[in-house]
Every structure is written in C-alpha cells, then in structure tokens.
C-alpha cells in the first residue's frame, strides 16, 4: 500500500495556506462513516500537511482517509484535485482531457454517469450553457472546444456540441459538468434525479 498515503500528502501539499486552513475546518464537520471518530480540533488546527496526512491515515486508514480527503476537497470546490487524488489511489485508465488525470473508470461507480443517462433531457432543457462553459474552460474543455460550443446558435445545439466531446471524458470530467449543472440549474438536476 502507501500509494493512498502519498496521494493524500500530495493533495494537501498542493493546497495554499488558506486552503489548508479551510480543509481542516471542513474536516471538523464533515459527515463520517459509522465507527470512525473525529480528529480532535486542538491537534488538527496546528498540523502541517505531513502531520495531517499521518493523522488522517492513522484515524481512517488509507482507503477511507483518501476518500474522506477527496470528499472535503470536493466540498471546497476543488473537484479537479479530488479527482486526481482518487486517480492516484485507484490507478484508473481512460482519456484525461485538459489537465485532469484519469480516475477509476468503474470502481464503485456502476452503470452510466448522470450526464450520459440524461443526455437528451440536458440537450433540451439546459439554458445557462455559458455558465457550464466557464466552469469547464481550461479544465475539461480546450480553447478550441470552448470556442466551438460558443459558436453554436442555440442552447440545444450548444449542448449537442458539448456532448460531442464527452465520449473522451472520464468520470471526473463528467462530475465537473454535473457540479456546474448543480450550481447553475439545480432544479433541473433535482428533477432529473427524481425521474
């Protein structure tokens, strides 16, 4: 093992001082799996990235520690880092657009991604395409792709163009799109999740 620990440390060392502070505060309130305790606040707040990694691994073991770290990073809006942390711990495969490492393709993620399940509905019902493009720009979409989607005349044709790039995306890339949809049209996502 050891890979998960290294990946946690790498993620934490790639947080700025402000982000590390925010990470610790979120760790104090993040929901935990049954049977796991919380790292004491006093000890937690004074730790550097290395100490915190050791503490996370000793409290939660490597696998759950990595998962918990990824959850907190995601909660901080750092989807890309969370995805890369999971990539490093699971060693997945598949194409990785515009600077995102490939996460596990199927581990604990059976079936189609939400984005693929609801492709037709999203093409028909997404209205705030510009928001999605800005959220994905430089992370999942290259400059060329971004411009190609923007050039389309209507929202459905923009979405259709956006979906033309998704076959090359991995799970993390699709998560970024889903996250952007939650931020821009949460009611639509909720509606589709219920359907």
């Amino acid at each position: 093992m050891g890979r998960a620990r290294d990946a946690i440390l790498d993620a934490l060392e790639n947080l700025t001082a402000e982000e590390l502070k925010k990470f610790k505060l979120k760790l104090l309130s993040v929901p935990l799996r049954e049977g796991y305790g919380r790292i004491p606040r006093g000890a937690l707040l004074s730790m550097d990235a290395l100490d915190l990694t050791d503490k996370l691994v000793s409290f939660y073991l490597e696998t759950y520690g990595a998962e918990l770290t990824a959850n907190v990073l995601r909660d901080m809006g750092l989807q890309e880092m969370a995805g890369q942390l999971q990539a490093a711990t699971h060693q997945g495969s598949g194409a990785a657009p515009a600077g995102i490492q490939a996460p596990p393709q199927s581990a604990a993620k059976p079936g189609l991604h939400f984005i693929d399940q609801h492709r037709a509905a999203l093409i028909a019902r997404v209205t705030n395409v510009e928001w999605l493009l800005d959220a994905l720009y430089g992370k999942v979409l290259t400059d060329e792709q971004y411009q190609a989607v923007r050039a389309e005349p209507t929202n459905p044709s923009k979405m259709r163009k956006l979906f033309s790039f998704t076959p090359a995306w991995n799970w993390t890339c699709k998560d970024l799109l889903l996250q952007a949809l939650r931020e821009s049209q949460s009611y639509l996502v909720e509606d589709l999740e219920r359907s």
Partner: antibody, heavy 118, light 107 residues
C-alpha cells in the same frame, strides 16, 4: 526523492529527427503527467505538451503539434519526446517536468541541449 | 492563447532588499499562476504554486499574491543565492504560457 534525469546533448543535421528521454524516479510514475518545455538561448520558456503516462493521453501546444511526439515506457519509467523535420529554430534546451495537481510543474529535469546544424 | 507579461525584464537590487516581480495575464486566470526560478546554471525550480502556495523546501522569504489578471512574487530579504531569472506561468487554459522572465541582479 523525486528525480527527473534527461538524456545528453544532441547535435543533429537539419531535416532529421531526434528522440530525447526523461527518466523518472522517486514517485509512482503512472499517477502523474509529464510535460515538456522549450527554451531558446537567452529567451523565455515555451510549453510544448504533456503526456499522462497512466493512459498515454497527450495534449500539445498547437505550435508543436506537427513537431513533437510524446510517448512513455511504463516498464522503465521513462518519457520520450521525438522532434521531427528539424531546423535551426529547433536548437534549444528542452526540459521535462512533472505536472503537479495545480497544473504547475513541480519537479524539473536538468535539460537536454539540442543543436541543429549542418 | 493567454499572454503573460513580465514588464520588467531585468532588475537590480541590493542584498537585504525587498524585491517585487510582477506578472500580468491578458485575461482573468483565477489564481492558476505559478512562479519558477531559473539559476544561472540553467536549473529550474518551482517556488510558488497557485498564486500563493509556497513550495515545500522553498525559503519563507518568498511569497506570492494577486488575483484576476495581476500577480506578483515578493522576496522579502534578498540573498546572494536568489540571483536568478524568475518566470510566471498560467495553467488555467491550454496552451499553458509563461511570462518572458525577470532577471534579478545584485547592485
């Protein structure tokens, strides 16, 4: 300790190709991207492209799309860059660097000097 | 492509000085800005990542700040070993681009 060791200097003829290497150690090779950067004498840095060695995915700077080809050998933890149809404009120092989680280049090789001359 | 501009190509300062090197992007780069040091022997090293994150092992006299399009690297107490060329780089959008560099010399 993370280390990136690049191959030695090359002197080649115009029109030919060259393949330089970047040998990595001290980390899990397949969980990171490796990127390449060009520096002409006395000039700035230009990003060429990157490869994710875990799956072979590549992205190139449009400017280098027909010039550079990035490949990797996971069994030996080495990344290669092949440059084709060489001209004097390709004479430069080429650096490999590991791609960090913020898309920064967190460890750098020492550079490979390429001289294209007849 | 996003243009990165370091308006000062060379800078002279005295040991112990506080030195600030600036970098401007042609559009908002949302803090995806990193600083590198290239020593006279050619070796390159990451100093600051994501605007303000100090790379482990880099002396605390180095700091980074900025937002939007304007960013800066500050060396609070210049030492002889800081003589080098400093480059900024954006990674918000492909192709990733560097500033032209600022060469720091001792007065």
């Amino acid at each position: 300790e993370v280390q990136l060791q690049q191959s030695g200097a090359e002197l080649v003829r115009p029109g030919s190709s060259v393949k330089m290497s970047c040998e990595t150690s001290g980390y899990t090779f397949t969980t990171y991207g490796l990127t390449w950067v060009k520096q002409r004498p006395g000039q700035g840095l230009e990003w060429i492209g990157y490869i994710y060695v875990g799956n072979g995915y590549t992205e190139y700077n449009e400017k280098f799309k027909d010039k550079a080809t990035l490949t990797s050998d996971t069994s030996s933890s080495i990344v290669y860059m092949q440059l084709s149809s060489l001209t004097s404009e390709d004479s430069a120092i080429y650096f490999c660097a590991r791609l960090g989680l913020r898309r920064h280049f967190d460890y750098w090789g020492q550079g490979t000097t390429l001289t294209v001359s007849s | 492509a996003i243009q990165m501009t370091q308006t000062t190509s060379s800078l002279s300062a005295s040991l112990g000085d506080r030195v600030t090197i600036s970098c401007r992007a042609s559009q908002d780069i949302s803090n995806y800005l990193h600083w590198y040091q290239q020593k006279p022997d050619g070796t390159v090293k990451l100093l600051i990542f994501f605007t303000s994150g100090l790379r482990s092992g880099v002396p605390s006299r180095f700091s980074g700040s900025g937002s939007g399009t304007d960013y800066s690297l500050t060396i609070s107490n210049l030492e002889q070993e800081d003589i080098a060329t400093y480059f900024c780089q954006q990674s918000i959008l492909l192709p990733w681009t560097f500033g032209g560099g600022t060469k720091l010399e001792i007065k």
